[in-house]
Interface confidence: medium
């Protein structure tokens, strides 16, 4: 195997596009005067206190005596999580609701993508049918004993063509009933506004997220949700894993809308997603937070990667570049200095849009906590990995340390974590337990040994369901659902029993 944090790692995927697609344009170079330099330096020093230095995360791979996150004595930690640790579980609307055109719901880009791109899948109607069997979901939540339930609202179920006019009454009723039921059970709702199911009409009329018109439309939709549901929702997520929306939706074509090969479109989409998130955060902060007193963030997903040789600086450069180009792409504007990472700006200057100074100011700090997703969607689809000698790693603890170092130790909600099993596995999902124990152990070590401020954990997922490009070939639920059955009973898997015990004991007891 070729040494290094090899190309083919997420963040270096642009090498799979022809170089013709990266057209050259000149950058403006500024000659800074002495006064300007001193002002910039002062601002940087101030910013350093707020954001940490970009590049600090590199220490994790270096042989740095001040940072050794894993040593032999720490391989497993028998301890409890902090008191009031926030235990939860999550689902995505498109993955579990079913009923894709029932009761006035409009089609989403994924409903369309399923029909045009996925073999042997006719629709999500064969899924867990959460839209029909809401009570069964609530019973499953009761069984586990979670503190919160993270779910997403299907935009086209509320507004069939995406435009905020009169809401679809049945859709509104469904989410209102769900929220009321959660509040009644003392389960905190964490609501995601956009988990990839863009109304198809917005794709067809505007080109979807490629068009900045969507920013205001998304803000209108968010405003409606805040108005209708904000009295019961204290935690909001604007967008789930925008990296995958941009990269796989418009780069590889593996996700809806299935466009591929246009690198400029990938980064335009990313740009619009960031601006949409920022607009919604400011909207919530100004108009809703004063009386609803909630928190709002965006879920950012990432892989983790290790150099084959920690003493080789070039390998470490590549690892840092890989993380910066995936997680930093979105985290830097929102949790960092308000702009794209410097390395991305340099390397992708011909296709990466530019934030104005006013926009940088507007983007910066538009998250009340760091919502982090760590799961197979950021690893598994990259079939280039084995070929290119990449040394990927499921080390959630080190990924959390990287976030701590890069973004000045933010409060972190693990907004999605878990692995997957083969579709043939029913309730005896021993691999899922092994993975969950491993991940939870890493989170506990991050909290207790590295002083990382993780305040909550979202196991993914509550139910087996539609798993995007993998459709129904894998399962991620803690509850087994027979998709061919009429009643879609939720049967607790071994992992559900295990997670229930973890929650009850608030960690690992000896």
């Amino acid at each position: 195997m070729k040494p290094g944090c090899a190309a083919g790692s997420p963040g270096n995927e642009w090498i799979f596009f022809s170089t013709d697609e990266i057209t050259t344009r000149y950058r403006n170079t500024m000659s800074n005067g002495g006064l300007q330099r001193s002002v910039i330096l002062s601002a940087l020093i101030l910013l350093r206190a707020v954001t940490g230095f970009s590049g600090d995360g590199r220490a994790i791979w270096s042989k740095n005596p001040n940072f050794t996150p894993v040593n032999e004595s720490q391989l497993f930690l028998y301890d409890t999580f902090p008191k009031n640790f926030f235990w939860g579980i999550g689902t995505g609307a498109l993955q579990v609701e079913g009923s894709w055109k029932k009761d006035g719901k409009g089609p989403s880009i994924w409903d369309h993508f399923i029909h045009t791109h996925l073999k042997n899948v006719s629709s999500t109607n064969g899924s867990s049918d959460s839209y029909i069997f809401l009570e069964k979901d609530l019973s499953a939540l009761d069984f586990i004993g979670v503190s919160f339930y993270q779910f997403s609202i299907s935009w086209p179920r509320l507004f069939p063509d995406g435009i905020v006019t009169v809401a679809n009454a049945k859709g509104l009723q469904y989410y209102s009933t769900l929220l009321d039921a959660l509040v009644l059970r003392n389960i905190e709702p964490i609501v995601t506004l956009y988990h990839w199911d863009l109304p198809l009409a917005l794709q067809e009329k505007y080109g979807g997220w490629k068009n900045d018109t969507i920013i205001d439309i998304f803000n209108d939709y968010a405003t409606y949700c805040f108005q209708m549901f904000g009295d019961r929702v204290k935690y909001w997520i604007t967008i789930h894993n925008p990296y995958l929306v941009a990269w796989h939706g418009y780069g590889t074509g593996m996700h809806a809308p299935g466009e591929k090969g246009n690198l400029a479109a990938v980064y335009t989409v990313g740009h619009n997603l960031i601006k949409a998130h920022s607009k919604v955060w400011h909207n919530y902060n100004t108009h809703f937070r004063p009386h609803q007193k909630g928190w709002l963030s965006i879920t950012l997903g990432s892989h983790w990667i290790e150099p084959n040789r920690s003493e080789n600086t070039m390998d470490i450069f590549k690892c840092q570049q890989s993380m910066v180009s995936v997680l930093g792409w979105f985290a830097n504007p929102i949790h960092g200095d308000g702009d794209y990472p410097e390395g991305m700006r340099k390397k992708l200057f011909s296709v990466l849009p530019i934030f104005s100074e006013a926009e940088k100011h507007e983007m910066r700090g538009t998250a009340d906590f760091f919502a982090f997703s760590f799961g197979p969607n950021n690893f598994k689809p990259l079939n280039t990995m084995a070929k290119m000698g990449q040394n990927v790693s499921l080390n959630l603890r080190e990924a959390l340390n990287w976030i701590k170092l890069e973004y000045n130790n933010p409060r972190i909600l693990i907004a999605e974590n878990g692995w997957f099993t083969d579709s043939r596995v029913k309730t005896e999902d021993t691999t899922a337990i092994y993975m969950m124990k491993n991940f939870l152990s890493q989170v506990l070590q991050a909290i207790r040994l590295d002083e990382i401020r993780v305040f909550g954990y979202t196991a993914w997922s509550l139910l087996d369901g539609f798993e995007w490009q993998d459709a129904y070939t894998i399962r991620r639920g803690l509850f087994y659902v027979d998709f061919n059955s009429k009643q879609k009973e939720r049967k607790p898997k071994s992992s559900a029993h295990y997670y229930k015990q973890i929650i009850r004991e608030n960690g690992f007891s000896l």
């Epitope: 290094g4 170089t19 390998d315 990472p341 410097e342 991305m344």
Partner: antibody, heavy 123, light 107 residues
Framework: QVTLKESGPVLVKPTETLTLTCTVS??????????VSWIRQPPGKALEWLTH???????SYSTSLKSRLTISKDTSKSQVVLSMTNMDPVDTATYYC???????????????WGQGTTVTVSS | DIQMTQSPSSLSASIGDRVTITCQAS??????LNWYQQKPGKAPKLLIY???NLETGVPSRFSGSGSGTDFTFTISSLQPEDIATYYC?????????FGGGTKVEIR
């Protein structure tokens, strides 16, 4: 304005040690994105990378010359020093000191070069 | 060490000609490749980074392409001031290495 200037002897005898100093201005050697490399070029021949010092004092050396090279820096004086032991006539070359911009650990390139200093090895 | 093989070692072309130089790496280096121009008696100058990105202020007649092991450097229309030796340089792995150079002359 960023500049690098090499200084040192123009003539050294075989078996002696060559010591070259690179004095930089316009940027700081402690800047986490900057490093300095030494590169040489024998008359009429290609460029050959010798060594590099990163901002955190990590060092890297050419495989074939590793045993003869030492690189160090004095941040307060804005200087990088190259030592090369056991000089031989084949080491006659122009020696360049080069700034390497790594853009917060995205290696980007040798963007500013010194004018070079010609060193002749002869008895 | 990664060997960089540049060809041709020298070429002669007329003003306005399209000039192409190739560089082959002994193993895959992704797009971790730069191109430098060195005029007689001068220090080299960075022209292209990451295989295809033009450095600020470099004329658009210069371009680069390729990834993995095979790379190409092109001057779309040769100008008198382009008389120089051109070097490829890999930074995929340490030690850093250069190609043997291609000397471009006017016919």
């Amino acid at each position: 304005q960023v500049t690098l200037k090499e200084s040192g002897p123009v003539l050294v005898k075989p078996t002696e040690t060559l010591t070259l100093t690179c004095t930089v201005s316009g940027f700081s050697l402690s800047n986490p994105r900057m490093g300095v490399s030494w590169i040489r070029q024998p008359p009429g021949k290609a460029l050959e990378w010798l060594t590099h010092i990163f901002s955190n004092d990590e060092k890297s050396y050419s495989t074939s010359l590793k045993s003869r090279l030492t690189i160090s820096k004095d941040t307060s004086k804005s200087q990088v020093v190259l030592s090369m032991t056991n000089m031989d006539p084949v080491d006659t070359a122009t020696y360049y000191c080069v700034r390497v911009d790594t853009l917060n650990y995205h290696y980007y390139g040798m963007d500013v070069w010194g004018q070079g200093t010609t060193v002749t090895v002869s008895s | 060490d990664i060997q960089m093989t540049q060809s041709p070692s020298s070429l002669s072309a007329s003003i306005g000609d399209r000039v192409t130089i190739t560089c082959q790496a002994s193993q895959g280096i992704s797009n971790y490749l730069n191109w430098y121009q060195q005029k007689p008696g001068k220090a080299p100058k960075l022209l292209i980074y990451d295989a295809s990105n033009l450095e600020t202020g470099v004329p658009s007649r210069f371009s680069g392409s390729g990834s993995g092991t095979d790379f190409t450097f092109t001057i779309s229309s040769l100008q008198p001031e382009d008389i120089a030796t051109y070097y490829c340089h890999q930074y995929d792995d340490l030690p850093l290495t250069f190609g043997g150079g291609t000397k471009v002359e006017i016919r």
